[in-house]
């Protein structure tokens, strides 16, 4: 088995759809607004959830943040970049009472949270601690800081076909 799973050639970092509030740190909004309906022919793989032209995978197994990152990459996806309020609500609606790693990390040098596509997160992260540099969602209605080394479930995200 490989640690560094190969990613699909079509893999692109999540971009936000439409204008969003600044705290979600959107990176390149679409001028077309939110995609609210499933368009004809768009498909997510088995066991993935469709929302706004994206596919989401919620794992049942648990792993560290780094291993979660590799897992998502191996599926041609990234850890979820939850950069719109709508996306957050959608994910909160489908998560169990469990913690799920997302693609949000704390950069100690600049003392700020960033999504893994480098866009800044200006919102609130609860449970902050000097050793908690990764983030989860799911158990509460907030973004929670967590140890990157503890094993949690994960949410992966990629483009719908």
């Amino acid at each position: 088995p490989q640690i560094f799973n190969k990613s699909n050639d079509g893999f692109t970092t999540t971009r936000s759809y439409g204008t969003v509030s600044q705290i979600f740190g959107s990176s390149s909004p679409s001028p077309n607004g939110f995609i609210t309906t499933r368009s004809y022919g768009t498909v997510c793989p088995k066991d993935w959830e469709f929302y706004q032209a994206r596919c989401f995978f919620l794992s049942t197994s648990e792993s560290s943040w780094n291993e979660s990152r590799d897992f998502c990459k191996g599926k041609g996806s990234t850890l979820a970049i939850v950069n719109t309020p709508e996306k957050l609500k959608f994910l909160q609606d489908i998560t169990d009472a469990e913690k799920y790693f997302i693609g949000l990390i704390y950069h100690r040098e600049e003392k700020r949270w960033r999504w893994i596509n480098n866009s800044v997160f200006n919102g609130n992260v609860t449970n902050q601690n000097q050793n908690f540099n990764c983030a989860t969602i799911g158990l509460t209605k907030t973004f929670d800081a967590a140890s990157c080394d503890i094993s949690y479930r994960r949410i992966c995200e990629k483009n719908a076909k």
């Epitope: 088995p1 490989q2 640690i3 560094f4 799973n5 190969k6 990613s7 050639d9 893999f11 692109t12 970092t13 560290s64 943040w65 780094n66 291993e67 990152r69 990459k73 990390i105 960033r114 893994i116 596509n117 480098n118 540099n133 990764c134 990157c148 080394d149």
Partner: antibody
Framework: DVKLVESGGGLVKLGGSLKLSCAAS????????MSWVRQTPDKRLELVAA????????YYPDTVKGRFTISRDNAKNTLYLQMSSLKPEDTALFYC????????????WGQGTTLTVSS | SIVMTQTPKFLLVSAGDRVTITCKAS??????VAWYQQKPGQSPKLLIY???NRYTGVPDRFTGSGYGTDFTFTISTVQAEDLAVYFC?????????FGAGTKLELK
């Protein structure tokens, strides 16, 4: 203070074997991916082996696959690299490195141990 | 495997110069790029991860940027202690690969 100290390098004949060790201290060894990176005489860097935190998953590039084996003993805070069927092109300075918190970049490097393969 | 083509191989600099090193990936690596500094007789040291994030304790004269295939590493004002070899590295895909290095030398 994070410390990685390699040992076990030396001069080996073509086709020979050697085992490198890396003693880690100053951090929770069992929580981190660890890797071996080598630097060839022309100063190029190459990842030669990686292992996840519990030792259950390993990775090797094609250049060393089947010849090198990475392992770890979390109780002893030690990383190993068993090398066999050595070739002259394996001659390099071998670094024990710790993977970063957010990916497979390397935030701590040992001082290195030298392997020389003679033909 | 992904090839990281680093340019230039050598750079002649004077103290106070602004220096730019580029790394071009043979395919998109998103922002999964790190930069390292290796001084003579020393091990490499991590400077930048995720293309633009300075590692803890790294002076702010060192910056990184880029996304996809083209990445830039800049030293805004070179100091004598910056004379070293600089390497880029991608961890987007296996095998993990490094650039060949750029050596900064005094004019």
């Amino acid at each position: 203070d994070v410390k990685l100290v390699e040992s076990g390098g030396g001069l080996v004949k073509l086709g020979g074997s050697l085992k490198l060790s890396c003693a880690a201290s100053g951090f929770t060894f069992s929580s981190y991916y660890m890797s071996w990176v080598r630097q060839t005489p022309d100063k190029r860097l190459e990842l030669v082996a990686a292992i996840n935190s519990n030792g259950g998953t390993t990775y090797y590039p094609d250049t060393v696959k089947g010849r090198f084996t990475i392992s770890r003993d979390n109780a002893k805070n030690t990383l190993y690299l068993q090398m066999s069927s050595l070739k002259p092109e394996d001659t390099a300075l071998f670094y024990c490195v710790r993977d970063g918190e957010f990916g497979h970049y390397f935030d701590y490097w040992g001082q290195g141990t030298t392997l020389t393969v003679s033909s | 495997s992904i090839v990281m083509t680093q340019t230039p191989k050598f750079l002649l600099v004077s103290a106070g110069d602004r220096v730019t090193i580029t790394c071009k990936a043979s395919q998109s690596v998103n922002n999964d790029v790190a930069w390292y500094q290796q001084k003579p007789g020393q091990s490499p040291k991590l400077l930048i991860y995720y293309a633009s994030n300075r590692y803890t304790g790294v002076p702010d004269r060192f910056t990184g940027s880029g996304y996809g295939t083209d990445f830039t590493f800049t030293i805004s004002t070179v100091q004598a202690e910056d004379l070293a070899v600089y390497f880029c590295q991608q961890d987007y895909n296996s095998p993990l690969t490094f650039g060949a290095g750029t050596k900064l030398e005094l004019k």
